[in-house]
Amino acid sequence: MKVLQEPTCVSDYMSISTCEWKMNGPTNCSTELRLLYQLVFLLSEAHTCIPENNGGAGCVCHLLMDDVVSADNYTLDLWAGQQLLWKGSFKPSEHVKPRAPGNLTVHTNVSDTLLLTWSNPYPPDNYLYNHLTYAVNIWSENDPADFRIYNVTYLEPSLRIAASTLKSGISYRARVRAWAQCYNTTWSEWSPSTKWHNSYREPFEQH
């Protein structure tokens, strides 16, 4: 039994790091393998992660961690019974993938303005809370070419757009994802999308 693709890990910079790897053949990850991880710090104890299958030869492990700080560094040992298959290390702050924003809502109660709001996926005491920026993707269900991305680089998780910038009388969907420049993170996953009907009416012109 050998490791074909070494484990790569990303952290949500809160409580979970996810490591993925591939074996050289079909493997029952949960029964045959264990990933041990330990914070490089005096008196810290080793923890064991039981991996799950992720495709035929792929494995994935969700490592539970206490509040992460930028200096944290973990040793990783991948075991198959008594056999050490791979040894490595992981610094969560250097491999951050933020959590996906939630609660995306499109407020359409004003005819000429759309307000899109969502929730920051971190609690206020987490460092990333004040450092996330967002990409909002809006697309038409009727027209694949009507696809736009708004890069929201201010802190407030909201986006106001004039309803007239979208086509009237058709349905749109929106989703949002996050990243943090300070840690040069990857993008989060997209939030679940939300749908609305854009029914903007041109203002009546008086002659």
């Epitope: 004003v110 709001t117 004040n130 708004y150 890069n151 802190l155 407030e156």
Partner: antibody, heavy 122, light 107 residues
Framework: QVHLVESGGDVVQPGRSLRLSCAAS????????MHWVRQAPFKGLEWVAV????????YYADSVKGRFTITRDNSKNTVYLQMNSLRAEDTAIYYC???????????????WGQGTLVTVSS | DIQLTQSPSLLSASVGDRVTITCWAS??????FAWYQQKPGTVPKLLIY???TLDSGVPSRFSGSRSGTEFTLTISSLQPEDFATYYC?????????FGQGTKLEIK
């Protein structure tokens, strides 16, 4: 059209409290973050506080943190600034302003009220 | 906190002159940067946002630009109504600080 009207300014003694109000009209108040900015006599502008569209987050200048509280009532289209433990250096005209605009460039104060004067003096 | 240093604090110029006012940010900021004009006894008025976008109704003789952490407001040909105090503001992260202001006076 957008209209912001501040009220509540007064002459108060150091250590006392005061609450300013800013009544908004002409736009969907609950869609917009609101700010307070102040200007001491013959001085420049100083940003004081912001409250997000839904009241969920509030941020303050270091000079007022722990003494001032910004709140809003979206049902009344009003934003407030509760000022406690007032000092002489809080003497200023206080403006409320809308965090305005559309799209991703919507980070500026596009409409301002006329201001209300707060004088802290014994 | 991001500090803004605005220069000059006082600028004397004549009608028709081209003038520039500069703001330096203490650290790199995104494009959330605005300029305001204030005349004595009146409320500040938004001139430029997102570094270079003119607010509606602002004459085209006003322009804004950026080079790194240096932001510039340029008035291409001063008009009598332009004599006022100008403030820069960053809106990148809280607190949203202002520059100290530049008073533009008639020479």
């Amino acid at each position: 059209q957008v209209h912001l009207v501040e009220s509540g300014g007064d002459v108060v003694q150091p250590g006392r409290s005061l609450r300013l109000s800013c009544a908004a009209s002409g736009f969907t108040f609950s869609y917009y973050g609101m700010h307070w900015v102040r200007q001491a006599p013959f001085k420049g502008l100083e940003w004081v506080a912001v409250i997000w569209y839904d009241g969920s987050n509030k941020y303050y200048a270091d000079s007022v943190k722990g003494r001032f509280t910004i709140t809003r009532d979206n049902s009344k289209n009003t934003v407030y600034l509760q000022m406690n433990s007032l000092r002489a250096e809080d003497t200023a005209i206080y403006y409320c302003a809308r965090w305005g605009g559309f799209g991703v460039t919507g980070t500026h104060l596009d409409y301002w009220g006329q201001g209300t004067l707060v004088t802290v003096s014994s | 906190d991001i500090q803004l240093t605005q220069s000059p604090s006082l600028l004397s110029a004549s009608v028709g002159d081209r003038v520039t006012i500069t703001c330096w940010a203490s650290q790199d900021i995104a494009g959330h940067f605005a300029w305001y004009q204030q005349k004595p006894g009146t409320v500040p008025k938004l001139l430029i946002y997102a570094i270079s976008t003119l607010d509606s109704g602002v004459p085209s003789r006003f322009s804004g630009s950026r080079s790194g952490t240096e932001f510039t407001l340029t008035i291409s040909s001063l008009q009598p109504e332009d004599f006022a105090t100008y403030y820069c503001q960053h809106l990148n992260s809280y607190p949203y600080t202002f520059g100290q202001g530049t008073k533009l006076e008639i020479k």
